[in-house]
């Protein structure tokens, strides 16, 4: 028998520095977690103690903090190289800055193979990107070889900016021939490493003949066997065992997100490459694990540029940006409009001639807007200003909801109106009229939404049975501010870009902004 240790991360999302327990900015260092310096300590400890170790990343290193905003992926290559990752799969967010924003900072600089079997380049890009990412890689480990085959969410064109010269194929269809090739190379230990979410990970384990282990990402799935060490609630045991169609037991793993845990899986193979046993657990990277001094020093060196960036002007406003709770928790506020407009703008994807865009709607809890921006400071808007407006380090995500769920959400928005509570929704691509004289749960008297399957966008009444795409904060997607119906009834959820980054990019693009209050949210006569 031959034993392999798989160390794995996924959805790190730019958390190079240690974070608080909820993966936001570290405040009290003695209680902080994660970060590449701490990760390196643990990885090195395991490498020294065990003979056959692979360190793998399942995608979405890009996007999530000011580190990515400033360094644009160079930080990912630098610190992943320093940690000596063995391989990485491409995630959807690796395409956030377009293909060039992937090629130059990461693909050309990574000292480890970057993989995806279901992304096929065409046209002029094919020769430019050739060899910079691979469908699979055979890695030598001790006296054996291990095949790693990569995959990426086929929804990436709707979630990021891969352009028109990359085709995202069905994962299972694309993986099978590559696994067959590995088998033909007499490689009998095969890991599928990819970024399509836990449901697809399980399907790959079930359907792709020859895959021995699946290491996934995208869905931020936390798996754990025994008593979990922090706040995350396990979605199942670690590893999650799937019985394949040909009768094999295939371990599937994921390691939550944000570098809070290091996935740790031990696999025992027989001489024919069959998995005999698998066990392990994610390792919580808490403050009991010291940060590696040399990596920490490097982080501090790179950090200097971030502090300078946060005070630079992104653009100007010529109007007061009203982000006060007195406005945003009670009525349409222009800060809410600005943020929603930025959210939609960030999700412009012309992937189908029938649609002007794949999504037109935005909702945003008023309580998530934490500060106004005064235009009387020469109109200057900085990252620092935006960090005061959006201090929680969240993301603006894409969900699919039925019209009936949206209606419930808008009823919830005003179910206890007047108490300055955070659930009052700011909107984009939506016209809502409330009648507060009616009883809670029956206050939405008009709800019109902007069409997407149209060449001239216009507002049509919401249809209860129709499925709509909506951009919203991850806080709402996870049921925050009492929006349990969103969490319970959403049909799809894909995590998006860092909230501040979305707004800062929009402001930089527009250069001068002047958002207005324009009648997106109305109250019917006599009730307000």
């Amino acid at each position: 028998a031959w034993e392999l240790t798989i160390l794995h991360t996924n959805d790190v999302h730019s958390r190079l520095e240690q974070t608080s327990e909820d993966s936001s900015k570290c405040v009290n260092a003695s209680r902080c977690m994660g970060g590449v310096a701490r990760l390196f300590t643990k990885v090195q400890q395991i490498r020294r103690a065990e003979p056959n170790v692979l360190l793998l990343d399942a995608g979405d290193q890009y996007q999530g903090t000011i580190w990515f905003t400033v360094y644009k992926g160079a930080e990912v290559a630098h610190f992943m190289n320093a940690l000596r990752y063995d391989a990485m799969a491409l995630g959807n967010h690796e395409f956030d800055n377009g293909v060039e924003g992937l090629i130059e900072p990461l693909l050309k600089e990574a000292k480890f193979p970057i993989l995806s079997a279901n992304i096929k380049a065409k046209g002029p890009l094919a020769s430019q990107i050739s060899g910079l990412y691979l469908p699979y890689k055979v890695l030598p480990v001790g006296d054996e070889v291990v095949g790693i085959v990569g995959y990426t969410s086929k929804e990436t064109p709707f979630l990021s900016n891969p352009g028109t010269n990359l085709v995202f194929e069905d994962e299972i269809t694309a993986l099978q021939p590559e696994v067959d090739k590995l088998k033909t190379l007499n490689v009998n230990k095969i890991i599928a490493l990819g970024h399509s979410g836990f449901e697809m990970d399980k399907l790959i384990a079930q359907k792709v003949r020859g895959v021995d282990v699946v290491v996934g990402g995208h869905s931020n799935t936390f798996l754990y066997t025994g008593n979990p060490p922090s706040k995350e609630v396990p979605a199942g045991k670690y590893p999650f065992i799937v019985t394949s169609d040909d009768g094999r037991k295939v371990p599937v793993v994921q390691a939550y997100a944000f570098g809070k845990y290091l996935g740790y899986l031990k696999i025992e193979f027989d001489e024919r490459g069959n998995v005999i046993s698998s066990h392990g657990n994610p390792i919580l990277l808490n403050s009991s694990i010291p940060e590696d001094p040399s990596i920490k020093a490097d982080i501090n060196k790179w950090r200097i540029k971030l502090d300078n960036y946060s005070t630079q002007e992104l653009g100007k406003t010529i109007v007061y940006l009203d982000g006060s709770s007195q406005s945003c928790r009670f009525r349409e506020c222009n800060m809410g409009n600005l943020i929603c407009d930025a959210m939609i703008n960030n999700n412009l994807r012309h992937t189908d001639e029938m649609f002007w865009n794949h999504v037109s709607m935005c909702i945003l809890n008023g309580g998530g807007i934490r500060s106004p921006i005064d235009e009387r400071n020469n109109g200057t808007i900085t990252w620092e200003n935006l960090a005061a407006v959006l201090p929680f380090g969240g993301t603006f995500d894409l969900v699919q909801l039925k019209g009936s769920t949206l209606k419930k959400a808008f009823e919830h928005s005003v179910h206890r109106y007047g108490q300055s509570t955070g659930e009052f929704l700011q909107v984009g691509g939506i016209h809502v009229v409330y009648d507060l004289s009616r009883k809670p749960g029956d206050r939405v008297v008009k709800l019109d939404v902007l069409c997407t399957k149209c060449r001239v966008p216009s507002y049509d009444p919401l249809k209860m049975d129709e499925v709509y795409k909506v951009i919203l904060p991850n806080f709402l997607a996870n049921g925050g501010d009492g929006f349990q119906m969103i969490k319970d009834e959403l049909l799809r959820h894909d995590s998006g870009d860092q909230d501040i980054n979305v707004v800062s990019t929009y402001i930089s693009k527009m250069k001068v902004i002047y958002p207005a209050v324009e009648g997106r949210i109305k109250f019917s006569t006599g009730s307000h």
Partner: antibody
Framework: QVQLQQSGPELVKPGASVRISCKTS????????IYWVKQRPGQGLEWIGW????????KYNEKFKGKSTLTADKSSSTAFMQLSSLTSEDSAVYFC???????????WGQGTLVTVSS | DIVMTQSHKFMSTSIGDRVSITCKAS??????VAWYQQKPGQSPKLLIY???TRHTGVPDRFTGSGSGTEHTLTISSVQAEDLALYYC?????????FGSGTTLEIK
């Protein structure tokens, strides 16, 4: 473009050792195997072994264990092969080569002629 | 070790002819076979891998076929620059092994 530049010819005495270098450029050194291949005059090709610079893993053809030692220097993107206890049987042209994606030899150095003679 | 046998040490041909060079493996190597061309004083050059996949820049007159133990390199219309030594190699398992070579010469 991918290039593998080998060190020049060597004339060595029996029993001595020789170290051949293979300096690479035009790609990320750590991401591909470097293979070494022996070709005796008028003879075929023999695979000596590989080194994977990413994790410095080395695999030898059993036939060449003890004869050759493979190393790599990531900082200079250079692979090395040392041949020890040389005999006339070791007189050959030695090639380094890079894989495309494992197991076949897509790019070759120009070869280094080693002559063992007293 | 897997032995790759190229039974023809030499093959004579004429410019414009179609020629097939064969290679037999001592055990099943599936489709894990590569072909190389070597000219005097030069290093080998990869032509084909995975039995039938042409390497970048290789003219389409070169094709590979076969599976299991029997493999063939075919040149559909021999050009003067094709006169060289051709080796097969199995990339199925280590140690990777080569055939002894077939020299293509003019009749």
């Amino acid at each position: 473009q991918v290039q593998l530049q080998q060190s020049g010819p060597e004339l060595v005495k029996p029993g001595a050792s020789v170290r051949i270098s293979c300096k690479t450029s035009g790609y990320t050194f750590t991401n591909y195997y470097i293979y070494w291949v022996k070709q005796r005059p008028g003879q075929g090709l023999e695979w000596i072994g590989w080194i994977y610079p990413g994790n410095l893993n080395i695999k030898y053809n059993e036939k060449f264990k003890g004869k050759s030692t493979l190393t790599a220097d990531k900082s200079s993107s250079t692979a090395f092969m040392q041949l020890s206890s040389l005999t006339s049987e070791d007189s050959a042209v030695y090639f380094c080569a890079r894989d495309d994606n494992y197991a076949w030899f897509a790019y070759w150095g120009q070869g280094t002629l080693v002559t063992v003679s007293s | 070790d897997i032995v790759m046998t190229q039974s023809h040490k030499f093959m004579s041909t004429s410019i414009g002819d179609r020629v097939s060079i064969t290679c037999k493996a001592s055990q099943d190597v599936s489709t894990a076979v590569a072909w190389y061309q070597q000219k005097p004083g030069q290093s080998p050059k990869l032509l084909i891998y995975w039995t039938n996949t042409r390497h970048t820049g290789v003219p389409d007159r070169f094709t590979g076929s076969g599976s299991g133990t029997e493999h063939t390199l075919t040149i559909s219309s021999v050009q003067a620059e094709d006169l060289a030594l051709y080796y097969c190699q199995q990339h199925y398992s280590t140690p990777f092994t080569f055939g002894s070579g077939t020299t293509l010469e003019i009749k």
